[in-house]
């Protein structure tokens, strides 16, 4: 209308996609009767009648809004349900009396995008690329209007930087009218970026205000050349023979270069390549003293064929040689003395100990063991242990058997054996002495003899129990060059009163074995030996 004041700015109504927009007609009573109103949508400056109000009753016009409009608030408000991005336009209400006036409403539509989906370059980024490479992409789906993207590295926003950082964003419109934003971060990375955390942030607006969504943080595979190569040995600390030792070649490049490990040969002064496993690790299992020496690693860049050499590393596999004892097979008369000497070599200072084999009792700390006034109980095993105190588990031992000359010594003097007539009896008899004795039986039967050790013998006799045998008993006789000795086994018939409920009938009836701990001879003690058990 000519001379009319300029139209005021439309009222702003903000609403989220899918919800209901309430369009309140702001005409005052002086501007028009709200019981007689026409509603229009304005799109690209074209008005389209969408709703009529007559006498307070509403009627939708055919078209895109037909099913989604209704009157509220006694006809003053038009409700638009299921708002879509296409509804972002101006709506106006026009009163019919007394004068034709209109009221304009700008509908703004919002939709939060989905969580941003960040993808990292699956092939990684070389630091020597000539141009910025695609580092990662960020996709924000189904937002409205188009969200803004900000890229972050280690918590700091990334800015466009000529030839260094370039952010390339594009958007597509889905059939729903929502936007999907794709942003590509292109950058020239440096070695220090190997641990950098990248993420993207979508900034968007809702009726409630400004909001943002962050992607997960990602690291980018960064490739950079090797500058330094070094060797690592596991386990750390002192190594000993028998250990599993791994010599590993390491480099500060990514991807790791091709490695070879070589060991210096002291005689030829040349390095000899060692055979490594697929990971370039040299495994020494078990480690031996011959593995000691100077190792170094060579790393090859297969693209450039440039090689780097590590600092050499000295490897010392500590050892203890075979232990030698002299005399190696000592023989002594009762009452005499003996000096045992132990020797060994090692890469470290050695400690020696002498132990009694049967009891593990420590007899001497040092390489020399002196024994005086030897008794026959002194016969048996003596162990020399050569160990490196600074390396637990590094030791070698040597056992020496001392033989004391003497006539046979029986494990028991006499013993009662319970038997049944006509049963086959298994009898055993044990004797010791030096020289080693032989055992004979005074009855016929099947006898077998076995060495327990160089000075001790065990004879077993299988015999049928007869009345004569019950009467005479059985004798076993042990003899050597220095004398003889006898043990007697008395046979007793089993009757009901003999057997007690806890008797082991099998043992009681069929066998007679003597253990070396049930001795029946005179005993004596000597210096540096444990007190003997009570015997006989």
């Amino acid at each position: 209308v000519p001379g009319e004041a300029e139209q005021p700015a439309p009222e702003l109504v903000e609403v989220e996609v899918g919800s209901t927009a309430l369009l309140k007609c702001g005409l005052s009573q002086s501007q028009g009767n709200l019981s007689h109103v026409d509603w229009f949508s304005v799109h690209k400056e074209k008005r389209t009648l969408i709703f009529r109000v007559r006498q307070g009753q509403g009627q939708s016009e055919p078209g895109e809004y037909e099913q989604r409009l209704s009157l509220q608030d006694r006809g003053a408000t038009l409700a638009l349900t299921q708002v879509t991005p296409q509804d972002e336009r101006i709506f106006l209400c026009q009163g019919k009396r007394p004068r034709s006036q209109e009221y304009r409403i700008q509908l703004r539509v919002y939709k939060a995008p989905e969580e941003p989906n960040i993808q990292v370059n699956p092939l990684g980024i070389p630091v020597n690329s000539k141009e910025p490479e695609e580092v990662a992409t960020c996709v924000g789906r189904n937002g409205y209007p188009i969200p803004q993207v900000i890229w972050y590295k280690n918590g700091r926003p990334l800015k466009e930087e000529k030839n260094r950082v370039h952010i390339q964003s594009s958007q597509t419109v889905e059939s729903s009218g929502l936007y999907t934003l794709q942003s590509i971060l292109k950058a020239q990375l440096v070695k220090e970026d190997k641990d950098a955390q990248f993420y993207c942030e979508l900034n968007y607006r809702l009726p409630s205000g400004n909001h943002m969504k962050e992607s997960r943080e990602v690291t980018v595979p960064v490739f950079y050349p090797t500058e330094k190569v070094w060797l690592e040995v596991e386990p750390v600390g002192m190594l000993k023979e028998g250990d599993r030792v791994e010599i590993r070649c390491l480099a500060d490049g990514n991807p790791p270069p091709h490695f070879s490990i070589s060991k210096g040969n002291p005689s030829t002064r040349e390095a000899e390549e060692e055979t490594t496993n697929d990971n370039g690790v040299l495994v020494l299992e078990p480690a031996r003293k011959e593995h000691s020496g100077r190792y170094e690693c060579q790393a090859w860049n297969l693209d450039t064929m440039i090689s780097l050499l590590s600092e050499p590393q000295e490897l010392l596999v500590n050892y203890v040689s075979d232990v030698r004892v002299s005399p190696a097979a000592p023989e002594r008369q009762e009452g005499s003395s003996l000096t045992l000497t132990c020797e060994a070599e090692s890469s470290q200072d050695l400690e020696f100990q002498w132990l009694r084999e049967e009891t593990d009792q420590v007899l001497e700390r040092g390489p020399v063991l002196q024994l005086h006034d030897l008794k026959r109980e002194a016969g048996g095993g003596y162990r020399c242990v050569a160990s490196v105190p600074s390396i637990p588990g590094l030791n070698r031992t040597q056992l020496v058997k001392l033989a004391i000359f003497g006539p046979p010594w029986m494990a028991f003097k006499e013993r009662k054996v319970w038997v049944k007539e006509n049963m086959v009896l298994n009898l055993s008899c044990e004797a010791s002495g030096h020289p080693r004795p032989t055992i004979s039986w005074n009855v016929n039967g099947t006898a077998s003899e076995g060495d327990q050790d160089p000075q001790r013998v065990l004879s077993t006799l299988n015999v049928l129990v007869t009345p004569e045998l019950l009467e005479t008993g059985v004798e076993c006789t042990a003899s050597n060059d220095l004398g003889k000795n006898t043990s007697i086994l008395f046979l007793e018939l089993v009757n009901l009163t003999t057997l007690t409920p806890d008797s082991n009938t099998t043992t009681g009836l069929s066998t007679s074995t003597a253990s070396p701990h049930t001795r029946a001879n005179s005993t004596s003690t000597e210096r540096k030996l444990p007190e003997p058990e009570s015997r006989g």
Epitope: Q119, S129, E134, T137, R216
Partner: antibody, heavy 116, light 106 residues
């Protein structure tokens, strides 16, 4: 529109070197990476190598020592060479465009037979 | 290397059936997964990227879902022209393809 076309020999002898060319149109090699993928008869797809929009090269470690990928941006061509060919390398070889990390367009493929 | 395992290796279904193909990664690949269709004697064709985004021009009966290690391609109503081998491919670390699933019509 975007197209990729592979060319090269259909038959190579064992121990020989294979050279394949991928000629592209509808996009620039300085904007998109290109990969080579192969498929032995009746078998699954296998990625071989790629060259990025910035010119960086990447190889499948299973073939790395035998492969070279390069490009000529002025001719819109990507070239793959594979040395020491073996009958097990008989396959259809495809080139494919990255967008930016997945493959959105593929060439029609070229069947390479390795036989003496 | 990341391995991708597809199941089943083949299936037969009737026209109009709902068909699902599974793909399992040997480690978490988030949503870095694409699905391809390869008809006999033809070139692989991109159907789905980023695990669930439908490539432009692909019918809406194709959909993708999943994230992490377990993914699914669904054909809501199988059509005769869908007879093909379908491959999943991860692009989280390098590129590896599944062994393929051959889809046939009963």
């Amino acid at each position: 529109q975007v197209t990729l076309k592979e060319s090269g020999p259909v038959l190579v002898k064992p121990t020989e070197t294979l050279t394949l060319t991928c000629t592209v149109s509808g996009f620039s090699l300085t904007s998109n990476a290109v990969s080579w993928v192969r498929q032995p008869p009746g078998k699954a797809l296998e990625w071989i190598a790629a060259i990025s929009s910035g010119g960086s090269t990447y190889y499948n470690s299973a073939f790395k020592s035998r492969l070279t990928i390069s490009r000529d941006t002025s001719k819109s061509q990507v070239v793959l060479t594979m040395t020491n060919m073996d009958p097990v390398d008989t396959a259809t070889y495809y080139c494919a465009r990255h967008r930016p990390f997945y493959f959105d367009y593929w060439g029609q493929g070229t069947l390479v037979t390795v036989s003496s | 290397d990341i391995q991708m395992t597809q199941s089943p290796s083949s299936l037969s279904a009737s026209v109009g059936d709902r068909v699902t193909i599974n793909c399992k990664g040997s480690q978490n690949i988030y949503k870095s997964l694409a699905w391809f269709q390869q008809k006999p004697g033809k070139v692989p064709k991109l159907l789905i990227y980023d695990a669930n985004s439908l490539q432009t021009g692909i019918p809406s009966r194709f959909s993708g879902s999943g994230s992490g290690t377990d993914f699914t391609l669904t054909i809501s109503s199988l059509q005769p022209e869908d007879v093909a081998t379908y491959y999943c491919q991860q692009y989280y670390s390098g590129y590896t393809f599944g062994g393929g699933t051959k889809v046939e019509i009963k």
